[in-house]
Interface confidence: medium
């Protein structure tokens, strides 16, 4: 799987929508977790509802939710209020009993707010975004951010 | 394995410029930004920015805003940290250190002295 | 910005005793804090990350707490290798800062 990366600003929310075969998935909780290094670890941030019927409800855990659209195939997970420590490796996950599939890799990165500080680090956003093995860059300069990822088979 | 590897020391005077490499491998270099820290003799650390690896994305200091600049080069997967109009109090060690976020920096450099004298 | 007090700036202890090192923010950095240990001459090495949770090859006597302002590092019984300089480090905001550290040396 190629990784996604992401930008974000500090203070503000980016959204992430990972999508994926309705079918194939049917029935299965997604979850949303944090990798410790490129071979390390998935630390679950946070879980859909433990009722798949139910998936569609927004679960909480600290500043980052998540709800699953099961009809549409999409997971969709919110990081509210980004800090600097948000910054790092995720994961969008389909479990199955104690097994979890990776749907999308996604590499969040927070950038200083230059709206915050004017004497803030620089941000440089090409005219074309730049791309490396496959993945996709998304700049965050608005307060609000989605990103929609291509079903994976 | 990952590794972070360094250029050497360095003796500048006063007024001058210097640039640092920090030459990766081990890992893929664009998934992972560099954070830069330094550390004057006894003294503690500090954090003097960070850049995307990704993209060229940087956040620096305030403190050192308008004397330093971050590049990356990922055609040989090194980042560099330039820092200009030295003075003798920049006289430190600086480290490169490879994360996503700040602080899941596995993997650190072995450190450049940068000796600041006239 | 958020400045890091670490305390005490020096700890004399024996092997075989538990440390407890302290590090208070001037505002919430919520659980955005690490630890890390230096020995002379070498890179700083992750201890804690996210105020609680040990860093990868670390061994269990080393254990992180505290969220908000107040934070402790505790050794629960020190080992000979464990005597060096300890630093604080906030991500909550930037910029990013660093404690001013606590040595922890042999009584």
């Known amino acids: 799987l190629n990784t996604t990366v992401l930008q974000g600003m500090a203070g503000q929310s980016l959204r992430v929508s990972c999508t994926y075969d309705a079918l194939k998935h049917w029935g299965r909780r997604k979850a949303w977790c944090r990798q410790l290094g490129e071979e390390g670890p998935c630390q679950r941030v946070v879980s859909t509802h433990g009722v798949w019927l139910l998936a569609f409800l927004k679960k909480r855990n600290g500043s980052t939710v998540i709800a699953d659209d099961t009809l549409a195939g999409t997971v969709t997970i919110t990081l509210k209020n980004l800090q600097a420590g948000d910054a790092g490796l995720y994961q969008c996950q389909s479990l199955r009993g104690r097994e979890a599939e990776v749907l999308q890799k996604v590499l969040v990165e927070v950038l200083e707010d230059p709206l915050d500080d004017q004497d803030a680090g620089d941000l440089w956003v090409p005219e074309e975004s730049s791309s490396f093995e496959g993945a996709q860059v998304e700049h965050s300069t608005s307060r609000n951010q989605e990103t929609s990822f291509p079903p994976t088979s | 394995q990952v590794q972070l590897v360094q250029s050497g020391a360095e003796v500048k005077k006063p007024g001058a410029s210097v640039k640092v490499s920090c030459k990766a491998s081990g890992y893929t270099f664009t998934s992972y930004g560099i954070s830069w820290v330094r550390q004057a003799p006894g003294q503690g650390l500090e954090w003097m920015g960070w850049?995307?690896?990704?993209?060229?994305?940087?956040n620096y200091a305030q403190k050192l805003q308008g004397r330093v600049t971050m590049t990356t080069d990922t055609s040989t997967s090194t980042a560099y940290m330039e820092l200009r109009s030295l003075r003798s109090d920049d006289t430190a060690v600086y480290y490169c250190?490879?994360?996503?976020?700040?602080?899941?920096?596995?993997?650190w450099g072995q450190g450049t002295l940068v000796t600041v004298s006239s | 910005e958020i400045v890091l007090t670490q305390s005490p700036a020096t700890l004399s202890l024996s092997p075989g005793e538990r440390a407890t090192l302290s590090c208070r923010a001037s505002q919430s950095v919520s659980s955005y804090l690490a630890w890390y240990q230096q020995k002379p001459g070498q890179a700083p090495r992750l201890l804690i990350y996210d105020a609680s949770n040990r860093a990868t090859g670390i061994p269990a006597r080393f254990s992180g707490s505290g969220s908000g302002t107040d934070f402790t590092l505790t050794i629960s019984s020190l080992e000979p290798e464990d005597f060096a300089v300890y630093y604080c480090q906030q991500v909550s905001n930037y910029p990013i800062t660093f404690g001013g550290g606590t040595k922890v040396e042999i009584k």
């Open positions: 850049i995307s690896a990704y993209n060229g994305n940087t």
């Open positions: 250190a490879r994360g996503p976020s700040h602080y899941y920096d596995l993997a």
